[in-house]
Amino acid sequence: LDLSNVQSKCGSKDNIKHVPGGGSVQIVYK
């Protein structure tokens, strides 16, 4: 299971991966 693009809704922003666009996002970051 590839979780490399998962963006936490409530955790630290430090692990946000820079992806090339919205098509790569799995969860909308709040």
Epitope: Q7, P20, G21, G22, G23, V25
Partner: antibody, heavy 120, light 112 residues
Framework: QVQLVQSGAEVKKPGSSVKVSCKAS????????ISWVRQAPGQGLEWMGE????????YYNEKFKGRVTITADKSTSTAYMELSSLRSEDTAVYYC?????????????WGQGTLVTVSS | DIVMTQSPLSLPVTPGEPASISCKSS????????????LAWYLQKPGQSPQLLIY???TRESGVPDRFTGSGSGTDFTLKISRVEAEDVGVYYC????????FGQGTKVEIK
Amino acid sequence: QVQLVQSGAEVKKPGSSVKVSCKASGGIFSDYVISWVRQAPGQGLEWMGEIFPRSGSTYYNEKFKGRVTITADKSTSTAYMELSSLRSEDTAVYYCARDYYGTSFAMDYWGQGTLVTVSS
Amino acid sequence: DIVMTQSPLSLPVTPGEPASISCKSSQSLLNSRTRKNYLAWYLQKPGQSPQLLIYWASTRESGVPDRFTGSGSGTDFTLKISRVEAEDVGVYYCKQSFYLRTFGQGTKVEIK
């Protein structure tokens, strides 16, 4: 309130390089992407590339790859766009914009623009 | 590359009348996981920097008048102005951010 303030107008010779700066205030600089967009006289908007200051990671428009370099200095909340091997067709207004990364991926704040004129 | 095509390129309007701009993408802008279309609309007024009007195809940016409405999904999108006002003149651009960023050619809205 986020504000993006760009450096002043430049006149450059063909073959030279230009470096435009974009200083951000308000908000947390490293939490969003800075995109660079240009507009030639009387033409539309053209996306050049972007940087995620937190990591320094960049993406570029294939059209400009090899000629454009986007960097960021987190300590001064400033992004830079350097374009090399300038030609007359690069005469344009260059904008930086905050790209609301991770949510809308939309550019919600824009700099005032920097006119770069390439002329011999 | 994702290509964005706007129509019409020029739109003469009468104040108080509705106006509509179409934007088509060469591939779908819908992310099935987030259920969002990564399509935004911008207005560039004469002599100004562009300003964000709509994101996620239909979400109005804060402070944007409710006469502006974005709709559509996948590859076909529309920006509607319910009643055009004089201050709405300028060039409207759609932009995809599904993969990298691409702007449409722009639609110039001017008063008849």
